[in-house]
């Protein structure tokens, strides 16, 4: 039994880090493998993660972690019974994938303006709370080509657009994701999408 693709891990910078790897053949990850992880400092405890299958030869482990600080560094040991398959380390602050934003809502009652709001996925005292920027994806359910991305580079979790920038009388969906430039994070997963029917008053044309 050998590791084909070494574990790569990302942290949500709050409570979970997720590590994924591939074995050299079909593996029952939960019965055959264990990932041990330990914060590097004196008297720290070793924790055991039981991996789950992620495709035939793929394994995934969710490592529970206390509130992350930038100095945190973990040793990782992947075991198959008594055999050490791989040894590595992981610094959560250097491999951050933010949590996905939540509660995406489209407010359609503001004078031909669409107001999209969502919730910051972090509590106020978390370091990422004030460092997230967002991308909002809006697309038409009727027309796959009607697909647009709005970059929200300010901290406020909201976006205003004129309803008239979208077609009237059809349904649209929106979703949002986040990233933090300060930690050079990857993008979060997309939030669940929300749907609305776009309609607005056409401006009165004078002849």
């Amino acid at each position: 039994m050998k590791v084909l693709q070494e574990p790569t891990c990302v942290s949500d910078y709050m409570s979970i880090s997720t590590c994924e790897w591939k074995m050299n053949g079909p593996t029952n990850c939960s019965t055959e493998l264990r990932l041990l992880y330990q914060l590097v400092f004196l008297l720290s405890e070793a924790h055991t993660c039981i991996p789950e299958n992620n495709g035939g030869a793929g394994c995934v482990c969710h490592l529970l972690m206390d509130d992350v600080v930038s100095a945190d560094n973990y040793t990782l040991d992947l075991w198959a019974g008594q055999q050490l398959l791989w040894k590595g380390s992981f610094k959560p602050s250097e491999h951050v994938k933010p949590r996905a934003p939540g509660n995406l809502t489209v407010h359609t009652n503001v004078s031909d303006t669409l107001l999209l709001t969502w919730s910051n996925p972090y509590p106020p005292r978390n370091y990422l709370y004030n460092h997230l920027t967002y991308a909002v994806n809006i697309w038409s359910e009727n027309d796959p080509a009607d697909f647009r991305i709005y970059n929200v580079t300010y901290l406020e979790p909201s976006l205003r657009i004129a309803a008239s920038t979208l077609k009237s009388g059809i349904s649209y969906r929106a979703r949002v994701r986040a990233w933090a430039q300060c930690y050079n994070t990857t993008w979060s997963e997309w939030s669940p999408s929300t749907k609305w029917h776009n309609s607005y008053r056409e401006p009165f044309e004078q002849h």
Partner: antibody, heavy 115, light 107 residues
Framework: QVQLVESGGGLVQPGGSLRLSCVAS????????MNWVRQAPGKGLEWVSY????????YYADSVKGRFTISRDNAKNSLYLQMNSLRDEDTAVYYC????????WGQGTLVTVSS | DIQMTQSPSAMSASVGDRVTITCRAS??????LAWFQQKPGKVPTRLIY???SLQSGVPSRFSGSGSGTEFTLTISSLQPEDFATYYC?????????FGQGTKVEIK
């Protein structure tokens, strides 16, 4: 081995105050965020409060906000819950529980609020 | 605040039965869900975290599934020591909230 021992519970009248303590051993307390969780007699679990190891951030359940204060003294390996303006509905066994996500619990201390 | 609704609140089952407990969140919590077991007079112990990750030392007859708002705890073959009360917990956001509990009793 990890141990959490709560104390400070007892009988108190409505409107009164009580301070609970939780002494930790078997791990580096200063490196762990901590929680208080309570359980009214015959009822379910209710999270009460959290204090971060990293930022000192504190969070409270709506039911205790403004009345309870969580704090810690890393030099004494101790977690505290100052409970003021106590009400009948605060009667419960109070547990301290360690992060991440309540991996270790103390045995609890009973707080009875009654006139 | 996020509400967690567990069902059923109580159930009777026999040794060897397959038992399923569900937990519904009032809004999306991704996989930030844990399951705890509490026996009478004892402190709770964590069985599952991150919706489906088995806590080390917990028997493999326990499993968790779900994401978003719908979650399930399954005991594949109920053992005598499994008669207890089970709670779900969301830690996606503060305040953290537990489900009201499911008591699994002997039929």
């Amino acid at each position: 081995q990890v141990q959490l021992v709560e104390s400070g519970g007892g009988l108190v009248q409505p409107g009164g105050s009580l301070r609970l303590s939780c002494v930790a051993s078997g791990f580096t307390f200063s490196h762990s965020s901590m929680n208080w969780v309570r359980q009214a007699p015959g009822k379910g679990l209710e999270w009460v409060s959290y204090i971060s190891r990293a930022t000192g951030a504190v969070y409270y359940a709506d039911s205790v906000k403004g009345r309870f204060t969580i704090s810690r003294d890393n030099a004494k390996n101790s977690l505290y819950l100052q409970m003021n303006s106590l009400r009948d509905e605060d009667t419960a066994v109070y547990y301290c529980a360690r992060e991440p996500v309540f991996d270790y619990w103390g045995q609890g201390t009973l707080v009875t609020v009654s006139s | 605040d996020i509400q967690m609704t567990q069902s059923p609140s109580a159930m009777s089952a026999s040794v060897g039965d397959r038992v399923t407990i569900t937990c519904r969140a009032s809004q999306d919590i991704s996989n930030y869900l844990a399951w705890f077991q509490q026996k009478p007079g004892k402190v709770p112990t964590r069985l599952i975290y991150a919706a489906s990750s088995l806590q080390s030392g917990v028997p493999s007859r326990f499993s968790g599934s779900g994401s978003g708002t719908e979650f399930t705890l399954t005991i594949s073959s109920l053992q005598p020591e499994d008669f207890a009360t089970y709670y779900c917990l969301q830690w996606s956001s503060y305040p953290r909230t537990f489900g009201q509990g499911t008591k699994v009793e002997i039929k």
